[in-house]
Structure formats: structure tokens, C-alpha cells
């Protein structure tokens, strides 16, 4: 049940056929077409920052670039939620926030982005190569998950405190800006295609010198495609993964919040066209998890963040559920 919109490979013309200008006019429509095709695909961005003031203090910011309303956000570390990751915070748009050590402060930044500050000390504190994941659920369309970690070069002790990247307002600037560019692009594309129809097409011959342009793969944002878009998340260095938060269980017996199933098999689906996503900040990794379900369902609109619930000292622990990796 997965359909892909295949953007045909475009052979560059032989030099001299139409010159650089002609080449540009031919390539641009395809680039714009890719943008138009992928424009409706919801995506998630993640930014991980180490604070310069506290060496092992992290700030994780995540945002949802889709149009649907968010029903729940789950932030985990050590891998995706349910695939061995440990839940740090769960944010509900109306009912507040639950967080577990070492999470210090989780909050909504906008209706579609959140931030989480992690404590820097203690046995369960994160380190530079920890992977952090954010999962945005939009019921009943499905969920999208992205993971990120600090780039190896990050050295907050030497560099100035990182400045918040423009992507932090991607939900506003990105959606408005990208939508505007895409709208213009799509109109321009139609204009180009109409002009192209009224004149004889130049003969395109395979170039002997230049290799074939890689085939761009775009995912059509139609409900029919229901494409599950997978980008393998960053590899986790287990030496740095915290001991699961079982150590924080002072009371015996199972924790009420102790188990998360894996919500789908992680099957890489090949390269995706990310043209519609603003480039994330340094130290980010963007991916779209399973559950791409483009058509919006009917849900009451959510209000802003509500009350904050106090964290359960026992903390959650991820467990493999029956929807595990096959």
C-alpha cells in the first residue's frame, strides 16, 4: 500500500545544445516539482545543544512541521521511544507535562515545538554522543519521530554559547516562508511547463562525461500513499547510554509508567527528498518516523499547555512491545 512519486532522472544535455540557460530551465522545474510533491509531508526537527555554562547540561528542542494538531509529544534518549529508548518527558497539549530525571524542565515553546533541559550531574546524566528522540503523535493520523545528537566537534567549553538557530521558529517562519516559496515555486513551475509545451522540446542525449543525475525520490503527500518514511536514526553509542531508570525506582513492584512498546518495525525506505524541510541547526538530525498519514482527521483543536504534573520519581522504562522489529 505504499506508492511513491518517482521524479524521473534528468540527463544533462550535451554542451552546446541549449547552453547553460536551457539546462537551468530544465532542471528548475524538476526541483520545484520535487518541492511541490513533498510540500505536504509532515516532518520533525530536533536540535541538541550542550550548554556552555554547565558542561553536561543539554537543551533539546523539537518541532513538528506538519499541519495536524499534536495529541502528544514524547522525548526519549538512547534511541527512539519504544526501541530501547528511555522516556524523559511526555507533553500533552491540554493536560500538562510529565518528566523524569534527569529532565529538569520540559515546556511548550509554541503549539508545535517543545524544549527540554536536562540536568548535568549524576549517574544518569547524558554525554556528548547520546541520541535524543522526539516523537510527535497526531491522532488518528499516526506519529512522526526524529532523533538527534551533538555533533562530535561540539566543544562548548571552548566555543561561545550556541545561538538558537533560525529553525527554532520553523513552525512559524518555516511554515510561512516555505509555504510562500513553495506556492511561488509551484506557480512558476506551472508557468514554465505551459511555456515548455508551446515550443519544441530539445533533444536530450545521455552525456558521456557526466554521470546520470541521481533519481530524486519524493513522497506524495496523498492519503492514498500512506507512506511510512524511515530514515535510520543515528547509531547509539551504548557506552554512553544511561543505565535504564530502574535505578530510580525506590519502591518495589512494577512502575505504572514502565513500558513502551516499539510502535513499528524500523525499515529504512531509501533516500527521501528533504527539500521542503528547513535545514536544521548544527547538531541536529532530522528524520520522519513511521505513521505518515497525510490526511487530517477530525479532532478538537488543542489549547496551549495546561497544568504541569509532578514527575513520578520512579521514571519510565522502555520495553519492547509486540510491534517490535521483525
Amino acid at each position: 500500500m505504499r506508492t511513491e512519486a518517482q521524479v524521473p532522472a534528468l540527463q544533462p544535455p550535451e554542451p552546446g545544445l541549449e547552453g547553460a540557460m536551457g539546462h537551468r530551465t530544465l532542471v528548475l522545474p524538476w526541483v520545484l516539482l520535487t518541492l511541490c510533491v513533498t510540500a505536504g509531508t509532515p516532518e520533525v526537527w530536533v536540535q541538541v545543544r550542550m550548554e556552555a555554562t554547565e558542561l553536561s547540561s543539554f537543551t533539546i528542542r523539537c518541532g513538528f512541521l506538519g499541519s495536524g494538531s499534536i495529541s502528544l509529544v514524547t522525548v526519549s534518549w538512547g534511541g527512539p521511544n519504544g526501541a530501547g529508548g528511555t522516556t524523559l518527558a511526555v507533553l500533552h497539549p491540554e493536560r500538562g507535562i510529565r518528566q523524569w530525571a534527569p529532565a529538569r524542565q520540559a515546556r511548550w515553546e509554541t503549539q508545535s515545538s517543545i524544549s527540554l533541559i536536562l540536568e548535568g550531574s549524576g549517574a544518569s546524566s547524558p554525554c556528548a554522543n547520546t541520541t535524543f528522540c522526539c516523537k510527535f503523535a497526531s491522532f488518528p493520523e499516526g506519529s512522526w519521530e526524529a532523533c538527534g545528537s551533538l555533533p562530535p566537534s561540539s566543544d562548548p567549553g571552548l566555543s561561545a554559547p550556541p545561538t538558537p538557530a533560525p529553525i527554532l521558529r520553523a513552525d512559524l517562519a518555516g511554515i510561512l516562508g516555505v509555504s510562500g516559496v513553495l506556492l511561488f515555486g509551484c506557480v512558476y513551475l506551472l508557468h514554465l511547463l505551459r511555456r515548455h509545451k508551446h515550443r519544441p522540446a530539445p533533444r536530450l542525449q545521455p552525456s558521456r562525461t557526466s554521470p546520470q543525475a541521481p533519481r530524486a525520490r519524493a513522497w506524495a503527500p496523498s492519503q492514498a500513499s500512506q507512506a511510512a518514511l524511515h530514515v535510520p536514526y543515528a547509531t547509539i553509542n551504548t557506552s554512553c547510554r544511561p543505565a535504564t531508570l530502574d535505578t530510580a525506582h525506590p519502591h518495589g513492584g512494577p512502575s505504572w509508567w514502565a513500558s513502551l512498546p516499539t510502535h513499528a518495525a524500523h525499515r529504512p525506505q531509501g533516500p527521501a527528498a528533504w527539500a521542503s524541510t528547513p535545514i536544521p541547526a548544527r547538531g541536529s538530525f532530522v528524520s520522519v518516523e513511521n505513521g505518515l498519514y497525510a490526511q487530517a482527521g477530525e479532532r478538537p483543536p488543542h489549547t496551549g499547555p495546561g497544568l504541569t504534573l509532578f514527575p513520578d520519581p520512579r521514571g519510565p522504562r522502555a520495553m519492547e512491545g509486540p510491534l517490535g522489529v521483525r
Epitope: 500500500m1 495529541s71 502528544l72 514524547t74 521511544n81 522516556t87 511526555v90 500533552h92 491540554e94 493536560r95 500538562g96 510529565r98 516523537k135 503523535a137 497526531s138 491522532f139 488518528p140 493520523e141 499516526g142 506519529s143 492519503q223 500512506q226 511510512a228 512494577p254 512502575s255 505504572w256 509508567w257 514502565a258 513500558s259 513502551l260 512498546p261 510502535h263 513499528a264 513511521n290 505513521g291 498519514y293 490526511q295 482527521g297 477530525e298 504534573l309 519510565p316 522504562r317 520495553m319 512491545g321 509486540p322 510491534l323
Partner: antibody
């Protein structure tokens, strides 16, 4: 391995109410939910409603609205379903199931309790 | 009367392939995921297929799901006697604002 263990069979009089419990063991719900699904003898499955224990949010099927109450008790890792104004047609096996509506945005049930038979008879 | 329509029964011989259909509308299958459950006699239902065509770990690849428009189907190939059970399709219904099930299909292995 997550297990949902439900309370025992009940025999109730018409007009009364019944409360069925569902205790999670071997790990539990976190951002997941608990739904209640019933099955009348020889009939199909019928969804009654759902709770996200972490936030206490509930969602009920239109048919049961006002007659069913779903709750959860965090310290004991237990979810409850109370059905009032019982009628003979409420005789059924009542299942609790872990759902993924909140966490994964999907109305899917991946773990089920063993079921509780509720008989409504005068 | 169930919101999703399934044939009451299907049958097949061991090794054969059978298909169970599930018909809905634009407010459920037409716009939302389809799930399939298997209920062996005297037991609780078990998740068989999720998100239209995905199989949970532990479910044999003899079971496959598909969806087209407002209909879905479950295919069981290489039938075995242990496949004899009731099969239910399910989806979210935007109009009813709830989970809906099919009436169930009894699969008999002859």
C-alpha cells in the same frame, strides 16, 4: 512482557452497576492508553472507551457516553471500567487492552487482558 | 449492525489461500488505518496486522493486509488448522469519533 490481568466474573442485577479492574504487570503504560472492548456471547467486538493514565484523559464511544466511567489508579498500576444502569444486553466478556492512541496516534490494541465475564440477570 | 462489513464466514483447505474482506466508508477505512485481530476460540483477541499492512513481530508472514479506498482485506496463505479462528477488522471512525470493528469472520479450515 506486559500482562494485563483482569478481575473475576460478575453476576449483576438489571439497573445496578459493575466495576471491572485491569492490573498491569511486567511493565506498563507510560504514554500509552487503556481501552475497554466488550464482546457479547457469539457476537463481535465493541469499543467502549479509553483512558491515558498518565494524564487521566478519557474518550468514550457515543453509545456508552454517560453510562460508562473509565479511571486509572497510578500507584496500583490498575485501570477500571464502571458500567451503570445495567441491562440484560450488557451481558458480555469485557476486555481491557493497551492502546496506542496517544503515543502513536493509532487506534490499535497491542496487549489484551484475559477478559471478565459480566452476566446481567434478574 | 457493525460499521465495518465482513463476510460471516470463509473456509479453505490446508495449504490454500483465503482472503477476508472488510468494507467501510470514507469516514473510517477511507481515511484511517486498518487493523486486523485474530481471536482463537475461548481466548482474547490478538493483534495480527496494524497500519493496513504491517505485521507485529511473531506474526507469520502468511498473514498479509492491504487497503484500497474504503475497503481492506486480510490474506491468509498456506492455511493451517491452527488458523481456524474469528478475524476482526478495525479502524477509527471520524464521524462516530471512536474505534469501530467489523462483525467478524469465522475462518474454517476444512
Amino acid at each position: 512482557q506486559v500482562q494485563l490481568v483482569q478481575s473475576g466474573a460478575e453476576v449483576k442485577k438489571p439497573g445496578s452497576s459493575v466495576k471491572v479492574s485491569c492490573k498491569a504487570s511486567g511493565g506498563t503504560f507510560n504514554n500509552y492508553g487503556i481501552s475497554w472492548v466488550r464482546q457479547a456471547p457469539g457476537k463481535g467486538l465493541e469499543w467502549m472507551g479509553q483512558i491515558i493514565p498518565l494524564f487521566g484523559t478519557t474518550k468514550y464511544a457515543q453509545k456508552f457516553q454517560g453510562r460508562v466511567t473509565i479511571a486509572a489508579d497510578e500507584p496500583t498500576s490498575t485501570a477500571y471500567m464502571e458500567l451503570g444502569s445495567l441491562r440484560s444486553e450488557d451481558t458480555a466478556i469485557y476486555y481491557c487492552a493497551r492502546d496506542r492512541m496517544a503515543a502513536d496516534g493509532m487506534a490499535v490494541f497491542d496487549y489484551w487482558g484475559q477478559g471478565t465475564l459480566v452476566t446481567v440477570s434478574s | 449492525q457493525s460499521v465495518l462489513t465482513q463476510p460471516p464466514s470463509v473456509s479453505g483447505t490446508p495449504g490454500q489461500k483465503v482472503i477476508i474482506s472488510c468494507s467501510g466508508s470514507s469516514s473510517n477505512i477511507g481515511r484511517h488505518f486498518v487493523f486486523w485481530y485474530q481471536q482463537l476460540p475461548g481466548t482474547a483477541p490478538k493483534l495480527l496486522i496494524y497500519k493496513n499492512d504491517e505485521r507485529p513481530s511473531g506474526v507469520p508472514d502468511r498473514f498479509s493486509g492491504s487497503k484500497s479506498g474504503t475497503s481492506a482485506s486480510l490474506a491468509v496463505s498456506g492455511l493451517r488448522s491452527e488458523d481456524e479462528a474469528d478475524y476482526y477488522c478495525s479502524s477509527w471512525d471520524a464521524a462516530l469519533n471512536g474505534v469501530v470493528f467489523g462483525g467478524g469472520t469465522k475462518l474454517t479450515v476444512l
